[in-house]
């Protein structure tokens, strides 16, 4: 368990051209208030699917109006951080939507008028117990400042905030098998031990010894399904072994949905399903139109003319999402050539190539061998983007460039004795033996395995090599 | 300028198939990778089949064995042949390329997008 906390520094206009207008007037002052919704892992989701890790409000901010002719500053701002708590684990990936909302104070009929400034959205890691992170992020011409961070509640400690720490029973050390709790290195760590043979999948505990179900699930290690074919009523009996849900007040209990909302139960909470032209965790807020500019990164806004209908963002090519707000994955189709890396960076794509490849889509061989002779009469050999040389008889090295010992790898057969020569190598063959690398035998009545000497070389003669 | 332009939706019933096309003009050097995407009401725009970089054509898990991408790179064209459609099929159906433009610079672009409905 613990708490991811949220602490805007600022909400005003981006840097830019085309300063927004301040959302308050003399004739309207208005107030704002933020609202963070948290998902698990690096979904993609819709804005309005469920904030499944949770979701805050902040306090309203305080009053403000407008100074006439005065470029809209920064607006002044809730007091306090936004404060999302977690039952469980913290997932360390983690996605972010942060709504800044406007309330209008003029006199209208019926109260307060809510509607949606900016919404910005993101994908982070973050380890629980580690420093604030800042963050900045920009939705249309505005741009919010903010810092986030999860921690963990004691007992637990650690980056998912899944261990737990214990204080000492010995003020030396820890019991056997248990080791000091950084950073609280007066405490112990102590397992989190629920009740033997609780089901890791469907039960979970909060303190050692006991296993709580999750919705579905029933029975003392709820392993048992629920099924309601055999209830007496929607909540059921209280008896485990029917495998019936276990009576008592749900969180749908009294309808916490405003304005008309329908409730519906989640593992460990509830959802709200809103009416037309509301919104928020309980169907609180109101209000979107599309004078509001809710669509991002060009998108056209249609409907929503006034806050009881509501308004669809139609995207251009390469974004989705409810508000456009999100890139659709380009890097999906493989653009990138020779195993390069494809990186989507929003204005464009791009490839990071592996060695020996370059170009735009990684599509160059690099071609060592131009502008690069290999010395000595050597020729360049390409191949998987590393060049070599092929060396001229005599030659050897990366370039060619040294003077190879001909006679190194022992050329000559049969016990002849190799001379290096300026074109080659030649080979005296031993008593008996002839050819360029003393490779035939002269057979014993005088006459060859070769068709004749060449003139002036009689057998046994050194031969030259060309 | 580079238009991709898509045809062949339509409606039809499970089971069936339909064929699009999708045809690419103007300022292009050469294709790099071409290929479809789609995307169901409520639902992420995903990739359905393609012509990699590297030429290799790629498929979704939910399509492999009922949809076929082929081309005819004297055309500029690419085709999706769908068969046994399901009710989930439904989508409207992208064309996208990345393509390498006359002043070398490589784009990638979108289509219009055509409406599949299968329904019985």
């Known amino acids: 368990a613990g708490v991811f906390e949220l602490q805007i520094h600022s909400f005003g206009p981006g840097p830019g051209p085309g300063a927004p207008r301040s959302p308050c007037s003399a004739r309207l002052p208005c107030r704002l208030f933020f609202r963070v919704c948290l998902k698990p892992g690096l979904s993609e989701e819709a804005a309005e699917s469920p904030c499944a890790l949770g979701a805050a409000l902040s306090a309203r901010g305080p009053v403000y109006t407008e100074q006439p002719g005065a470029p809209a500053p920064d607006l002044p701002l809730p007091d306090g951080l936004l404060q999302v708590p977690f039952r469980d684990a913290w997932p360390g990936t983690f996605s972010f939507i942060i709504e800044t909302w406007r309330e209008e104070l003029g006199d209208q009929i019926g109260g307060p008028a809510w509607s949606l400034l900016a919404r910005v959205a993101g994908r982070r890691r973050l380890a629980a117990g580690g420093p604030w992170a800042r963050d900045i992020q920009r939705a249309g011409a505005w741009e919010l400042r903010f810092s986030y961070r999860a921690r963990c509640e004691p007992p637990a400690v650690g980056t998912a905030c899944t261990r737990l720490c214990r204080p000492r029973s010995a003020p030396s050390r820890c019991g056997p098998g248990l080791r000091p709790c950084a950073p609280l290195e007066d405490e112990c760590e102590a397992p989190l031990v629920c009740r033997a043979g609780c089901s890791p999948e469907h039960g979970f505990c909060e303190q050692p010894g006991e296993c709580r179900c999750l919705e579905g699930w029933t029975g003392p290690l709820c392993t048992v399904p629920v099924s309601t074919s055999s209830c007496l009523s929607p909540r059921g009996p209280s008896s485990a072994t029917t495998g019936c849900l276990v009576p008592g007040p749900g969180p749908c209990d009294g309808n916490p949905c405003a304005n008309g909302g329908s409730c519906s139960e989640t593992p460990r909470s509830f959802e709200c399903t809103c009416p037309r032209g509301f919104y928020g965790l309980r169907c609180e807020v109101s209000g979107v139109t599309c004078a509001d500019g809710p669509c991002f990164n060009g998108g056209l806004c249609v409907g929503g003319a006034d806050p009881d209908s509501a308004y669809i963002c139609h995207c251009p090519p390469g974004f989705q999402g409810s508000n456009c707000e999100k890139r659709v994955d380009r890097c999906s189709l493989q653009p990138c050539r020779n195993g390069g890396l494809c990186l989507d960076l929003g204005h464009a794509l791009r490839c990071r190539c592996r060695a020996g490849f370059a170009g735009p889509r990684c599509e160059h061989d690099l071609d060592d061998c131009a502008g690069r002779a290999c010395a000595n009469g050597g020729t360049c050999v390409e191949g998987g983007g590393a060049h070599r040389c092929s060396c001229a008889l005599g030659f050897g090295g990366r370039d060619c460039r040294e003077r190879a010992d001909p006679c190194a790898a022992r050329p000559c057969a049969h016990g002849g004795r190799c001379y290096a020569h300026f074109s080659g190598l030649v080979c005296a063959c031993a008593p008996g033996y002839m050819g360029a690398r003393c490779e035939f035998p002269v057979h014993p009545d005088g006459a060859s395995a070769l068709p004749a000497a060449p003139p002036g070389l009689r057998p046994g003669d050194p031969q030259r090599y060309l | 300028e580079v238009q991709l332009v898509e045809s062949g939706g339509g409606e039809v019933q499970p089971g069936g198939s339909l064929r699009l096309s999708c045809a690419a003009s103007?300022?292009?050097?050469?294709?790099?990778?071409m290929g479809w995407y789609r995307q169901a009401p409520g639902k992420q725009r995903e990739m359905v089949a393609g012509?990699?970089?590297?030429?290799?054509?790629i498929y979704a898990e939910s399509v492999k064995g009922r949809f076929t991408i082929s081309r005819d790179n004297a055309k500029n064209t690419v085709y999706l042949q769908m068969s046994s459609l399901r009710a989930e099929d439904t989508a409207v159906y992208y064309c996208?390329?990345?393509?390498?433009?006359?002043?070398?610079?490589?784009?990638?672009?979108w289509g219009q997008g055509t409406l599949v409905t299968v329904k019985p």
């Open positions: 103007g300022s292009i050097l050469s294709i790099n990778a």
């Open positions: 012509f990699t970089g590297e030429g290799n054509t």
């Open positions: 996208a390329a990345d393509v390498q433009l006359f002043s070398r610079d490589y784009e990638f672009y």
